[in-house]
Interface confidence: medium
């Protein structure tokens, strides 16, 4: 159906984009964009005169806060104030509707259903999604900000979706893919939260994502030189071939008893006691 | 509930072209379309999608190639500037799925298809 | 960028039957998944959404399954007019911004 403006509104200066709106352009205001704005401040021929500016400042009028309902236009009069209604309302206020479902007021695919008293003749039973008695207001509901964890929210309009920040899952990021909570490492490993996946840092013995795989500490070949690997319950000893010494069988022993031990610090001989 | 393509026709390389997908039976402001389209012996492959408030989203080959647009009932694919490598048949479908998830899951698919109109870009 | 990797691109097997179609994601996808049938010269049918979902109107020979990033589509007692391809697509709106909603390559199925 065409959009309705409100009644009266000015074809040249004003516009809607909502049943019932007067939209003024740049240069035209009033309820109906039929006033043009003026450089002047001193336009009111009514009220008490301002102290600062010596121009008269409006007093309150019977229009002020438009009385008028359902985008009805209102007129001062000498007495009081006249509403020019819109097509399918009436009353003193416009507050009475004249339009039924045979008008077809409801947008968007609004469902339209007979009202039940005589001051509302139609109801709008509105999709999801859209909202107002003509269900002309789209519902903005990513602003209800239903994405979690900085995610970015998407109204298809079937279904809300949500784009996950890396390290969030979920139809709402709700799952935190890095967090160590409930993951459990086996064999006295501990968790490590980073890179977009939790993972485990396993004791000695152990491998493998979860820590569950026994880990044999001598696969890799770790003793120099031709020193024989035992898997110890601490880790690894190694027995080192002869003529050769250290934790890994790294360092040589000279014939002359003395060792290629890296050299000592300065300030220290070795034999020395390190302070 | 249908949807139904039209438009496609041959176009010399160059030539701007709009696809029509109408639809019936259900309302445009509450669902996602999505246009895929399908090169003669070839899969599948998803064109974009335009949400039920009217915000198109891509695929990034797409990008400046395509632009889709919907009124109450219909919605456009506009290609820009086709090439010879433009020339498939284009569907368009509408996207289905739930509200909200139950668990950590939800779903999407694309249902009802149209029988797809054929673009040949040649020169 | 989310990619599916549907594999075998073709299968063979006699009336009655079963073929097994899998289709890989390069990241978990969360069960988001839908399987397409198509015939020549005709538009797609969504036979499963959300992994393992069957469309109404799809016989329960057609059976879906999967998690994660690894998904399958079983067809059992297969008939003639099963003869087709079959496409699997993402469903899942996720972090890649390349496409969201890629299909695999698709499989073709023989029935003989």
């Known amino acids: 159906a065409p959009l309705v403006c409100r009644a009266g509104c000015s074809p040249e200066h004003g516009f809607c984009e909502q049943p019932g709106e007067c939209r003024c352009l740049e240069g035209w205001t009033g309820p109906l964009c039929t006033v043009p704005v003026s450089t002047s401040s001193c336009l009111s021929p009514r009220g008490p005169s301002s102290a600062t500016t010596g121009c008269l400042v409006p007093g309150p009028g019977p229009c002020d806060g438009n009385p008028c309902a359902n985008g009805g236009s209102c007129s001062e009069t000498p007495r009081s104030f006249e509403c020019t209604c819109p097509r399918g309302f009436y009353g003193l206020r416009c507050e009475v509707s004249g339009v039924t479902c045979a008008d077809g007021p409801c947008f968007n695919g609004g469902l339209c259903v007979g009202g039940a008293d005589p001051d509302s003749a139609y109801i709008c039973h509105c999709p999801p999604g859209f909202q107002g008695s003509n269900c002309e207001k789209r519902v903005d509901r990513c602003s209800l900000q239903p994405c979690r964890n900085g995610g970015l929210c998407l109204d298809l309009g079937h279904a809300l979706r949500c784009r996950c920040r890396a390290g969030f899952a979920g139809p709402r990021c709700e799952h935190d893919l890095d967090d160590c909570a409930g993951r459990a490492c086996a064999n006295g490993g501990t968790c490590v939260e980073g890179g977009g996946a939790h993972r485990c840092s396993c004791a000695l013995g152990f491998g493998g994502r979860d820590c569950r795989e026994r880990a044999d500490p001598c696969a890799a070949r770790p003793c120099a030189h031709g020193g024989r690997c035992y898997a110890h319950f601490s880790g690894l000893v190694c027995a080192c071939a002869p003529g050769y010494m250290g934790a890994r069988c790294e360092f040589p022993v000279h014939p002359d008893g003395a060792s290629a031990l890296p050299a000592a610090p300065p300030g220290l001989r070795p034999g020395d006691p390190q302070r | 509930q249908s949807v139904e393509e039209s438009g496609g026709r041959l176009v010399t390389p160059g030539t701007p072209l709009t696809l029509t997908c109408t639809v019936s039976?259900?309302?445009?402001?509450?669902?996602?379309m999505s246009w895929v389209r399908q090169a003669p012996g070839k899969g599948l492959e998803w064109i974009g999608i335009?949400?039920?408030?009217?915000d198109p989203y891509y695929a990034s080959w797409a990008k400046g190639r395509f632009t889709i647009s919907k009124t109450s009932t219909t919605m456009d694919l506009k290609i820009t500037s086709p090439t010879t490598e433009d020339t498939a048949t284009y569907f368009c479908?509408?996207?289905?799925?739930?509200?909200?998830?139950?668990?950590?899951?939800?779903?999407?698919?694309?249902?009802?298809w149209g029988p797809g109109t054929l673009v040949t870009v040649s020169s | 960028a989310l990619v599916m990797t549907q594999t075998p691109s073709s299968v063979s097997a006699a009336v009655g039957g079963t073929v097994t179609i899998n289709c890989q994601a390069s990241?978990?996808?969360?069960?988001?998944l839908a399987w397409y049938q198509q015939k020549p010269g005709q538009r797609p049918k969504l036979l499963i959404y959300?992994?393992?979902n069957l469309e109404s109107g799809v016989p329960s020979r057609f059976k879906g399954s999967g998690s994660g990033t690894e998904y399958t589509l079983t067809i059992s007692d297969l008939e003639c007019d099963d003869a087709a391809i079959y496409y699997c697509q993402s469903a899942y709106y996720t972090t890649s911004v390349d496409v969201l909603y890629p299909f695999g390559g698709g499989t073709e199925v023989v029935v003989k």
């Open positions: 959300g992994a393992s």
């Open positions: 990241q978990n996808i969360y069960s988001n």
């Open positions: 479908a509408r996207m289905i799925g739930s509200e909200y998830a139950s668990s950590s899951e939800y779903y999407d698919a694309f249902d009802p």
């Open positions: 335009i949400t039920g408030g009217g």
């Open positions: 039976g259900f309302s445009l402001s509450r669902y996602a």
